[in-house]
């Protein structure tokens, strides 16, 4: 079984030292010195800052929650998939 | 081809600032992260932050906070970074890279750095 | 925020040698990434997520590791191979990226 846990919004701090929103807009054709669009890579967090954020579990991106969450593998649980059920 | 082009040295008095300029070419800011890297001499590399192009959304070490900003301008295809109140600590070449990859992104491109001297 | 340490500092061999290095984080990440650094250059892109080889990266090169221990190795050392290599990864949250402080690779 896969437990998905709760959904977490990557941070919004919008100061004008610092702005810490990990939230992907979505992206407009074409674009000065764009690329072929085939071979773009749409950006989620979880292939960049959120790499190693799931530790015993899976990222997702939920793209319209503009949020990640982790899908835990069995036996974990917990926001980040980091703790093991006594069972 | 894929390259980041970075603006000349700078030599700074204490308590200046300054800006450093990455331009990107053969691809799109917008479709990446772009980050800033310090490294001083004869040390180790340091991770300042990194701008989202698409939204301008940033993100700092929390050393650098106060100290570094990270703009970006899409229409020019650019990231700069800006350093303030400099003083010898800053002493250092700035890089700028761009994070990308297949399924698990990494600093695929890096600019040539820009050598930033602070001295009266 | 998780430290990465490299060991060791420095790494001396010989021609022809096999060689390992260490990153250690200070807990379990899922992806580590490894850049060369030759003095007077930018660093490049070596190793990225564990074991894949960057562009034009020789094959005598692999990475390999799991949860807080990773590592590079060299199976026959050659004389381009000597400078200082860096492993990097994303933790905590909000994410924050570091380095480990490098090993440098010189030949004998």
């Known amino acids: 079984s896969v437990r998905v846990e709760q959904v977490v919004k990557p941070p919004q701090n919008k100061t004008e030292s610092e702005n810490t929103s990990d939230k992907p807009k979505r992206k407009k054709k074409g674009g000065k010195n764009g690329k072929n669009r085939r071979n773009r890579k749409k950006k989620n967090p979880c292939n960049a800052e959120f790499q190693n954020f799931c530790i015993h579990g899976e990222c997702k991106y939920i793209e319209h929650l503009e949020a990640v969450t982790c899908k835990c593998q069995q036996e974990y649980f917990g926001e980040r998939c980091g703790e093991k059920s006594m069972k | 081809e894929v390259q980041l082009q970075q603006s000349g040295a700078e030599l700074v008095k204490p308590g200046a600032s300054v800006k450093l300029s990455c331009t990107a070419s053969g691809f799109n800011i917008k479709d990446t992260y772009m980050h800033w890297v310090k490294q001083r001499p004869e040390q180790g590399l340091e991770w300042i932050g990194r701008?989202?192009?698409?939204?301008?959304?940033?993100k700092y070490d929390p050393k650098f906070q106060g100290k570094a900003t990270i703009t970006a301008d899409t229409s020019s295809n650019t990231a700069d970074l800006h350093l303030s109140s400099l003083t010898s600590e800053d002493t250092a070449v700035y890089y700028c890279a761009r994070l990308y990859g297949d399924s698990v992104w990494y600093f695929d491109v890096w600019g040539a750095g820009t050598t930033v001297t602070v001295s009266s | 925020q998780i430290v990465l340490t490299q060991s060791p500092a420095i790494l001396s061999a010989s021609p022809g040698e096999k060689v390992t290095m260490t990153c250690r984080a200070g807990?379990?990440?899922?992806?580590i990434h490894w850049y060369q650094q030759k003095p007077g250059s930018s660093p490049k892109p070596w190793i990225y997520?564990?074991?894949n080889l960057a562009s034009g990266v020789p094959a005598r090169f692999s990475g390999s590791g799991s949860g807080t221990s990773y590592s590079l190795t060299i199976s026959r050392v050659e004389a381009e191979d000597a400078a200082t290599y860096y492993c990097?990864?994303?933790?905590?949250?909000?994410?924050?990226?570091?380095f480990g402080a490098g090993t440098k690779l010189e030949l004998k």
């Open positions: 997520a564990t074991s």
């Open positions: 701008i989202d192009p698409a939204n301008r959304s940033t």
């Open positions: 807990s379990s990440v899922n992806y």
């Open positions: 990097q990864q994303w933790s905590g949250y909000p994410p924050m990226l570091t």
